[in-house]
Interface confidence: medium
């Protein structure tokens, strides 16, 4: 008969370092005391009669345990299978680039260090939740790669590396270790550089804006920007627009930047770089100066005007150019009362980097002179009808303006300049006096008013009523003759004898 | 162009130690591994190790752990082999080679370093 | 460790012929995730050795299609269907399925 020598449990798993309770038994009825055969360490916890129980301690890794025993002289064996499983010490996903180009690929590399038994796991690259590639682990410790494309809809997604331990099988269910994310960026940074537009000329110490655009940008708000007027950093406001960055900053030069210069815009993202520089040339340009000899004169006094510009430079004062040509120019004038109020303006040319640069100054000179009253704007003789609607006007000119007062008698005065009526009480002679610091004058004024004669009018009336009675009346009386010959002629034809010639009643 | 140029010969006293570099150009350095073989006359070819630039992790043959030491540059895409208490036994042509992290084959080899031990 | 055991030690040949060679493993090259990682390299006299094929048949880019490889678990082999000039060398076996990587002892082609 043969007999067997069982050994339970059959082809366990368990977890790396755990322990197990062997038990081997056999039906041989003479059987000798049973033996176990392991490289793991074990203890002999009970036995009897066919039997023996033993207990292995700290199984890190696969084995085979052997029962052996001696029956009836022969040796019969059984043997079981350990399985031993274990969780990946580590499992870790290498450091992304700080930042990826879209449209390029990146390399996902993950780590696995232990873990066990390998035909049973799994490493999968994860984006989001969404599985880019899914390997067996395989060489310890497992590397896993993974290319992808980087797209914008990338940008700020969370890669992860997992494990997967599949003890399903065995009962065991699926073990999952998942790396700590790493959060990708994505750019775009066009090949174009920014469109940089700045002044080809600057003076000194004047303000000029600079603009610095870059479209097609990913993401704009994550780029930096770099304004420089030659080595001076320019405080520049940063504004995007969806893929658009607008820089915009004010240059201002100094004297010590004057000559040739470089605006220089640096667009960066992503580690790298776009550049525009445009040629700038700071210059200095002072005047022109147009200078008066005195900005207020009397007239008939001597006036120099002189206009200065840069050595460089050439002037034009009021149109005409310095003889020689260059820089100054002036001009000699007697002040008339023409001449108040009159500007004279110095343009002065100069030529930077092969471009012609034009400043102009204006000054205006002012003449006293007066006061005046002459007959054209001053009548010395007013008629005007009594009753009647009347302005009196009178201008006295000069510069100041003269003050201008009109009385009669030393007390009545004229109301210039406004509407009146006219009453007897306004004929006679006024003295007009403008006075201003330039002097006074005097001038005078007759007003005439005409009073209507009444005797005049009522004879004027009474003729037009005789006349036009007298024409009334004729001409009623002419109308009733006529109606009366024409009746008795009607009665004559019809033979109807006539009546004795009566007054008869108007009809 | 993938290539692997290797340091030129050595020729050192029993005892010393060698470094041999190995610079790779023409692909991205820490997508794939390196490793080391030696050519010797009565024993063929014998792989020594491998490192993975990115993590700089090494796996070694038993036999020649203790005895090479393998290290990478990645800011100059160089691999490094230093080799410790030479012997005869030790002279030999070292071959440094490229494979993907995958365990394929290796794909591009360098020119090879002939080291010579002897006093 | 994986002994690869080539044979003959050296083939000498005709141009124009037909030659092969076998690798045998001391264990199967079946990795835990079905691939078979045994691969050929030629070495050319004075040069390095240069990968012919990989993964059992997988010509390398550039290899003429002349060569082949076949096999499966543990025994292999490499085939030249025309032997040219240029195919002169010693040709290794290699298996990277376990470590350590290890190679055969070659096969010296030559001209008969």
């Known amino acids: 008969q043969e007999f067997l020598l069982r050994v339970e449990p059959q082809n366990p798993v368990l977890s790396a370092g755990g322990s197990l309770f062997v038990n081997c038994s056999t039906d041989c009825p003479s059987s000798e005391k049973i033996a176990l055969e392991t490289s793991l360490s074990k203890e002999l916890v009970a036995s009897g009669m066919g039997w023996a129980a033993f207990n292995l301690s700290n199984v890190t890794g696969n084995s085979r345990i052997l029962c052996s025993v001696y029956c009836n002289g022969s040796q019969i064996t059984g043997s079981s299978n350990i399985t031993v499983y274990g969780l990946p010490e580590r499992v870790e996903l290498a450091p992304l680039p700080p930042w990826q180009p879209v449209g390029q690929n990146f390399t996902l590399r993950c780590q696995v260090e232990g873990g066990s038994p390998r035909t049973s796991l799994t490493v999968v690259l994860l984006r989001w939740e969404e599985e880019l590639s899914r390997q067996p682990a395989v060489e310890e410790p497992a590397e896993v790669t993974a290319t992808v494309l980087a797209s914008r809809d990338d940008h700020g997604a969370p890669f992860s590396c997992r494990t997967e331990l599949d003890m399903q099988p065995q009962g065991l269910g699926l073990f999952v270790n998942t790396s700590a994310p790493r959060q990708l960026r994505t750019f775009v940074l066009p090949v174009t550089p920014p469109r940089l537009v700045a002044p080809r000329f600057l003076e000194v110490e004047t303000s000029w804006p600079v603009d610095c655009t870059l479209d097609g940008l990913f993401p704009a708000s994550e780029a930096q920007v770099y304004l420089a007027l030659g080595d001076q950093m320019l405080n520049a406001t940063v504004m995007n627009h969806g893929d658009t960055l607008t820089a915009t900053a004010t240059a201002t030069a100094r004297a010590d930047q004057e000559g040739a210069r470089e605006i220089v815009c640096n667009v960066t993202l992503g580690g790298e770089r776009r550049e525009a520089r445009e040629n700038l040339t700071v210059f200095s340009f002072l005047g022109p100066i147009v200078n008066l000899t005195k900005p207020e004169v009397s007239e008939g006094t001597e006036v120099t005007v002189k206009c200065e510009a840069h050595p460089r430079a050439k002037v034009t004062l009021n149109g005409v150019p310095a003889q020689p040509l260059g820089p100054r120019a002036q001009l000699l004038l007697k002040a008339t009362p023409e001449d108040n109020g009159r500007s004279f303006s110095c343009s002065a040319t100069l030529e930077v980097a092969g471009q012609l640069i034009h400043k102009n100054q204006t000054r205006e000179l002012r003449v006293l002179y007066g006061p005046r009253l002459d007959e054209r704007d001053c009548p010395g003789n007013w008629t005007w009808p009594e009753n009647s609607q009347q302005t009196p006007m009178c201008q006295a000119w000069g510069n100041p303006l003269p003050e201008l007062k009109c009385l009669k008698d030393g007390t009545f005065p004229l109301p210039i300049g406004e509407s009146v009526t006219v009453t007897r009480d306004l004929e006679g002679t006024y003295l007009c006096r403008a006075r201003s610091t330039q002097g006074e004058v005097t001038r005078k004024v007759t007003v005439n008013v005409l009073s209507p004669r009444y005797e005049i009018v009522i004879i004027t009336v009474v003729a037009a009523a005789v006349i036009m009675g007298t024409a009334g009346l004729s001409t009623y009386l002419y109308n009733r003759q006529r109606k009366i010959k024409k009746y008795r002629l009607q009665q004559a034809q019809k033979g109807t004898p006539m009546k004795p010639n009566t007054q008869a009643t108007p009809p | 162009e993938i290539q692997l140029q290797q340091t030129g010969p050595e020729l050192v006293k029993p005892g010393a130690s060698v470094k041999i570099s190995c610079k790779a150009s023409?692909?991205?350095?820490?997508?794939?591994?390196i490793l080391w073989v030696k050519q010797s006359h009565g024993k063929g070819l014998e792989w020594i190790g491998k490192?993975?630039?990115?993590?700089?992790?090494?796996t070694y043959n038993l036999k020649f752990k203790g005895k090479a030491t393998l290290t990478v540059d990645k800011s100059s895409s160089t691999a490094h082999m230093q080799l410790n208490s030479l012997t005869s036994e030790d002279s030999a042509v070292y071959y440094c080679?490229?494979?993907?992290?995958?365990?394929?084959?290796?794909?591009?080899w360098g020119q090879g370093t002939s080291v010579t031990v002897s006093s | 460790d994986a002994v690869m055991t080539q044979t003959p030690l050296s083939l000498p040949v005709s141009l124009g012929d037909q030659a092969s060679i076998s690798c045998r493993s001391s264990?199967?090259?079946?990795?835990?995730?079905?691939?078979?990682?045994l691969h050929w390299y030629l070495q050319k006299p004075g040069q390095s050795p240069q990968l012919l094929i990989y993964?059992?048949?997988n010509r390398f880019s550039g290899v003429p299609d002349r060569f082949s490889g076949s096999g499966s678990g543990t025994d292999f082999t490499l085939k030249l269907s025309r032997v040219e000039a240029e195919d002169l060398g010693v040709y290794f076996c290699s298996q990277s399925t376990h470590v350590p990587y290890t190679f055969g002892g070659g096969t010296k082609l030559e001209i008969k």
């Open positions: 490192i993975n630039p990115y993590f700089g992790t090494t």
């Open positions: 993964k059992v048949s």
């Open positions: 264990q199967s090259l079946v990795h835990s995730n079905g691939d078979t990682y």
């Open positions: 023409g692909y991205s350095f820490t997508d794939c591994i």
């Open positions: 080679a490229r494979k993907e992290a995958y365990p394929d084959a290796m794909d591009y």
